[in-house]
Interface confidence: medium
Amino acid sequence: ARNGDDCPLGPGRCCRLHTVRASLEDLGWADWVLSPREVQVTMCIGACPSQFRAANMHAQIKTSLHRLKPDTVPAPCCVPASYNPMVLIQKTDTGVSLQTYDDLLAKDCHCI
Amino acid sequence: ARNGDDCPLGPGRCCRLHTVRASLEDLGWADWVLSPREVQVTMCIGACPSQFRAANMHAQIKTSLHRLKPDTVPAPCCVPASYNPMVLIQKTDTGVSLQTYDDLLAKDCHCI
């Protein structure tokens, strides 16, 4: 995977990790999560130009076919390649519990 | 994962498996693949409206934040959830070889 500095569209415009600050209200979690009150959500955002961070052979195929039929075949999309775990303190009937979520915060990104 | 018939945008418009016929020339493979001459490429195409085939918690977060900040946070994207293997007969210096690719054809789809 090439790094974000290789982006042919200009610095920072290609698929990479971004952080978006979100409150429990933003996420619709206010009624079942106690803590944290705010989450630094890491997610994958940006363009996937030809062969940039291509995840696999499928992504390469998608790039080729998108060029031939842009109205039919979508370009590859910037999505998480792996995740960081996050612990949420949740409300329960009996009080609170700690729950680890393995698929909540993107760790790094690729195009697929 | 809900099936494609639940698509709120109309039948067949949401994230689902499509087949696109492609020749070796279309894929740019003519110089290194002998067979098959044509590939039925299965790929994931379609919209990902709210919570449709959400792959995980991250996809749910993305949906929430996209609604709040559509210019900043993209909607979830329709990508393969798993793949079917495919065997290609390749040209080599000494003749031909059979190579199995595990990440070439999408098997089913989800939104992430």
């Epitope: 290609c14 130009p49 030809s50 031939l68 842009p70 910037c78 | 016929r21």
Partner: antibody, heavy 119, light 111 residues
């Protein structure tokens, strides 16, 4: 060089079927990425995209007219065809064919053929 | 379907002036690879349309550099830096990212 030329009946009566032919040279519809579209323009009005056929016989239609349109091709004769059923006076227009190359844009157009539908 | 709205409908200019035509799409026509399949065509009186600009800002070979395209997301603009007599006609934007659609056209004419 690339050229495209449209031909058609010129005049039709309402409810008849329109058959148009686009004859082209300078490229082949067997080449990956190539396609041909039909586009029409009523006199003094704007352009309306009708249909597109890809090199692999994949077809696209304007959804508002899809039930009346059929696009086809004869690759060996370098021709693309369009049929429009049940024409009426609103189909009176100049009909163009245009080549859609890589990434979809129309780099070459025919000079157009005029159709008048009389009631 | 994507609706392409062009403004203005008519643009009276003096020769040598700059001209600017806007095209707005009803939804984003940006693909996730950064491509936007947005084109500009010029149709001179009695002629077929001719491609000027493709992928928002790329000039077709042979098109004078006084023509430039820009834009992102749903908004695109065609600028002509110094209008010449041969530039007069109707300009159309077109998107090929979704079901293909043309804008309604903008007539560039002498003031």
């Amino acid at each position: 060089q690339v050229t495209l030329k449209e031909s058609g009946p010129g005049i039709l009566q309402s409810s008849q079927t329109l058959s148009l032919t686009c004859s082209f040279s300078g490229f082949s519809l067997s080449t990956s990425g190539m396609g041909v579209s039909w586009i029409r323009q009523p006199s003094g009005k704007g352009l309306e995209w009708l249909a597109h056929i890809y090199w692999d016989d994949d077809k696209r239609y304007n959804p508002s007219l899809e039930s009346r349109l059929t696009i086809s091709k004869d690759t060996s004769r370098n021709q693309v065809f369009l049929k429009i059923t049940s024409v009426d006076t609103t189909d009176t227009a100049t009909y163009y064919c245009a080549r859609g190359g890589y990434d979809g844009y129309y780099d070459y157009w025919g000079q157009g053929t005029t159709l008048t539908v009389s009631s | 379907d994507v609706v392409m709205t062009q403004t203005p409908l008519s643009l009276p200019v003096s020769l040598g002036d700059q001209a600017s035509i806007s095209c707005r799409s009803s939804q984003s026509i940006v693909h996730s690879n950064g491509n936007t399949n947005l084109e500009w065509y010029l149709q001179k009186p009695g002629q077929s349309p001719k491609l000027l600009i493709y992928k928002v800002s790329n000039r077709l070979s042979g098109v004078p550099d006084r023509f430039s395209g820009s834009g992102s997301g749903t908004d695109s603009t065609l600028k002509i830096s110094r209008v010449e007599a041969e530039d007069l006609g109707v300009y159309y934007c077109f998107q090929g990212s979704h079901v293909r659609t043309f804008g309604g056209g903008t007539k560039l004419e002498i003031k």
